[in-house]
């Protein structure tokens, strides 16, 4: 494959469970896959009571919701677990909501993780 | 290599629910979707739902809707699709795959509804 | 979403090149580069063969090729083999805000 500006070759790594999932808790993740399919970046969190808890972060497959995103933001209006994807490496490292509603203006909040 | 390996057949009554799993592995489970689709006897393929394995997001058709429920376990990378309100027309083999472009597909299950 | 309309059945000889067609709307299969083709063998679950309109599956013979005309995808396998005989489904992506949806399918014999 030809690598574009955009092609993801590596993703900040996340996961709230790692001591259940065996895995890191954070770093960054390489991502694999069919040399002709495109990857993607993505972060899931959830707002419990306007806090911010990452939920995971790392690579994603091949998805047509992510093509073209530079940046990684939510437009599902007031999901359970938030989920954003993007491409280009690292584009995970910050996430944003933009609810799409048709009447009102999305307001913007925009997250940049801290380590816990 | 990826492999998605479902359970194994199914005899169920009308009026009762089935669900069938789907054990990813080969991969990093929370990294796609999980689609499901069935084919009955002498028929085509039907999609019936997807579920986003990380965030947990479902979708269903409108054929399905309430009917069925589709939940992923990260913890063990199995998949699960639950029909419930079995009648007849459900006997099919029922299949998870791979991604939103079905990449890898499970060996199906059949499911035979019969009184 | 309605189903996506192929023909019951196409056939061709070995060597021959034949094409199977899959038609949507101008919202689905016109507008967008989702369509994807799986082959089925009896009795075994379909294979990716190929996606969004015209990439080839990894490990797929160059033979099999995809492409898009308006509301109507197609696919083409050229120097047909007797092997290639199978049923033959487009489908669409089906993820996040997407939707699935199938082809009747199509039956292809090798005569």
């Known amino acids: 494959a030809i690598l574009g500006r955009s092609e993801t070759q590596e993703c900040i790594f996340y996961n709230a469970n790692w001591e259940r999932d065996r895995t890191n808790r954070t770093g960054v993740e390489s991502c694999y896959g069919d040399k002709d399919k495109r990857r993607h970046c993505f972060a899931t969190w959830k707002n419990i009571s306007g806090s911010i808890e990452i939920v995971k972060q790392g690579c994603w497959l091949d998805d047509i919701n992510c093509y073209d995103r530079t940046d990684c933001i939510e437009k599902k209006d007031s999901p359970e677990v938030y989920f954003c994807c993007c491409e280009g490496s690292m584009c995970n490292e910050r996430f944003s909501y933009f609810p799409e509603m048709e009447v009102t203006q999305p307001t913007s909040n925009p997250v940049t993780p801290k380590p816990p | 290599q990826v492999q998605l390996v479902q359970s194994g057949a199914e005899v169920k009554k009308p009026g009762s629910s089935v669900k069938v799993s789907c054990k990813a592995s080969g991969y990093t489970f929370t990294s796609s979707y999980i689609n499901w689709v069935r084919q009955a006897p002498g028929q085509g393929l039907e999609w019936m739902g997807t579920i986003n394995a990380v965030s947990g997001s479902t979708s269903y058709a409108q054929k399905f809707q309430g009917r069925v429920t589709i939940t992923a376990d990260t913890s063990t990378s199995t998949a699960y699709m639950e029909l419930s309100s079995l009648r007849s027309e459900d006997t099919a083999v029922y299949y998870c795959?791979?991604?939103?472009?079905?990449?890898?597909w499970g060996q199906g299950t059949l499911v035979t509804v019969s009184s | 979403q309605s189903a996506l309309t192929q023909p019951r059945s196409v056939s061709g000889s070995p060597g021959q090149s034949v094409t199977i067609s899959c038609t949507g709307t101008s919202s689905d299969v016109g507008s967008k580069n989702y369509v994807n083709w799986y082959q089925q063998h009896p009795g075994k679950a379909p294979k990716l063969m190929i996606y969004g309109v015209s990439k080839r599956e990894s490990g797929v013979p160059d033979r099999f090729s995809g492409s898009k005309s308006g509301n109507t995808a197609s696919l083409t396998i050229s120097g047909l083999q007797a092997e290639d005989e199978a049923d033959y489904y487009c489908g669409t992506f089906a993820g996040g805000k997407y939707y699935g949806v199938f082809g009747g399918g199509t039956k292809l014999t090798v005569l």
């Open positions: 795959a791979r991604g939103g472009w079905f990449d890898y």
